[in-house]
């Protein structure tokens, strides 16, 4: 008897973080033997949607013409072949921004930082929230850090970084959210440009560089105690 069918691949275009009102397409890619594709949404009646495969039958398209709160959540897809249903795909977390008013992002003590020193990015919301997210534009992993204050409602979250280096430099934004729905985020804050001075760009280690020089180590992952997040929204609780 053959083993279980391989799980399909699930992804979203143009991405998994979508502003309110924008369109998004969810793709499920299985095998050429697929006869039908099914998309399930967590905490919704299954199936959330069914689609016939597009030629050459190895994938299906699920279209969301206008993003709203109802579409935000965690999805998995399956495909049916002549021998039965596949294993579920890895989950896709579809996040909607624009659910709440934008927070304010600032840098303490200053957005101009010397390499080898520290900076704290402060995300502040007008109304109390329990979850804050910091992103860095054009980062390999743009959704970097989410924290919850033990369920307590807070007006702000601090994101400490040390030691700062040239890699920390760039444009940051933050979002806020409520714990009851981590898939609904605020509008993004206005951008904050972090400028790191005194950095030496050197692709190889220098055995004689000491702390008295201007150079600093590269940036650390912004996840507090975890590894760099993968695609989609990776949460870390404190």
């Amino acid at each position: 008897q053959a083993g279980p069918l391989p799980k399909p691949t699930l992804w979203a275009e143009p991405g998994s973080v979508i502003s309110w009102g924008n369109s998004v397409t969810i793709w499920c890619q299985g095998t050429l033997e697929a006869r039908e594709y099914r998309l399930d949404k967590e905490e919704s009646p299954a199936p959330w949607d069914r689609q016939n495969p597009l030629e050459p039958k190895n994938k299906a398209r699920f279209s969301i013409p206008s993003m709203t709160e109802d579409y935000a959540g965690r999805y998995r897809c399956y495909y049916r072949s002549p021998v039965g249903w596949s294993q579920p795909s890895d989950p896709l977390e579809l996040v909607m921004t624009g659910a709440y008013s934008k927070p304010t992002l600032s840098a303490l003590p200053s957005p101009l930082v010397t390499s080898g020193k520290s900076v704290t990015l402060l995300c502040q919301s007008r109304s109390p929230m329990d979850t804050f997210l910091l992103i860095k534009e054009r980062a390999a992993h743009p959704l970097l850090h989410l924290r919850s204050e033990h369920g307590a409602q807070q007006h702000q979250a601090e994101f400490p970084m040390s030691p700062v280096t040239s890699v920390h430099g760039g444009t940051y934004r933050c979002f806020s959210s409520h714990g009851f729905s981590h898939y609904l985020l605020s509008h993004p804050s206005d951008p904050l440009e972090l400028i790191v001075s005194g950095s030496l760009e050197d692709p190889r280690p220098s055995p004689t560089r000491s702390v008295s020089t201007a150079a600093g180590p590269e940036d650390q992952p912004l996840m507090p105690t975890g590894s760099v997040p993968h695609s989609g929204l990776r949460r870390h609780w404190e």
Epitope: K117, S118, E158, P160, P163, P205, S206, P217, E218, Q220
Partner: antibody, heavy 118, light 107 residues
Framework: EVQLVESGGGLVKPGGSLRLSCAAS????????MHWVRQAPGKGLEWVSY????????YYADTVKGRFTISRDNAKNSLYLQMNSLRAEDTAVYYC???????????WGQGTLVTVSS | DIQMTQSPSSLSASVGDRVTITCRAS??????LNWYQQKPGKAPKLLIY???RLHSGVPSRFSGSGSGTDFTFTISSLQPEDIATYFC?????????FGGGTKLEIK
Amino acid sequence: EVQLVESGGGLVKPGGSLRLSCAASGFTFSDYGMHWVRQAPGKGLEWVSYIFSGSSTIYYADTVKGRFTISRDNAKNSLYLQMNSLRAEDTAVYYCARADGRGAMDYWGQGTLVTVSS
Amino acid sequence: DIQMTQSPSSLSASVGDRVTITCRASQDISKFLNWYQQKPGKAPKLLIYYTSRLHSGVPSRFSGSGSGTDFTFTISSLQPEDIATYFCQQGNTLPWTFGGGTKLEIK
């Protein structure tokens, strides 16, 4: 479970060399900066050196600058400290520690003792 | 370099006591102050980072406070397993520096 295991310590004469190793497991080593910290017998902690994940930039304490070299091999999940021109005052337990990106060292190895004596 | 002054250097307390250790930085380090516990013959363990955030798995009887140059570490109710030496460390500016340590003993 995060684990850091140092090795390579021992007795060496003044002016001699040693190479310490730190084997990491239980986390994605290439995602983290790493430190060496030392502790002389009965004394406090002294930060020695820091290397970030890609080895592109490095820091040393002034007390070891020019004598010690920190390096890493991400493919082997290993951190190293090459110690040359050793002095009696370098005698200490040497710990490797993982950087948390916020100014702290969140996990430490058990340490390896380096004794510099004639 | 930033100097870290920790006091007292030793402390004797009874089980159930509230224990407080202080750490002073020679210049402003914002909240980049960490506390470690070290038992004899063992490696240090991170207890508190960024002044007051508890590292994973650390009991809630440990806490920290402060900002700028003056910081406090507190054990709300001393337990026998808390007998150790405690170090503060600034992570604001390289080179990172440690306090001299506080050796905690049971009365």
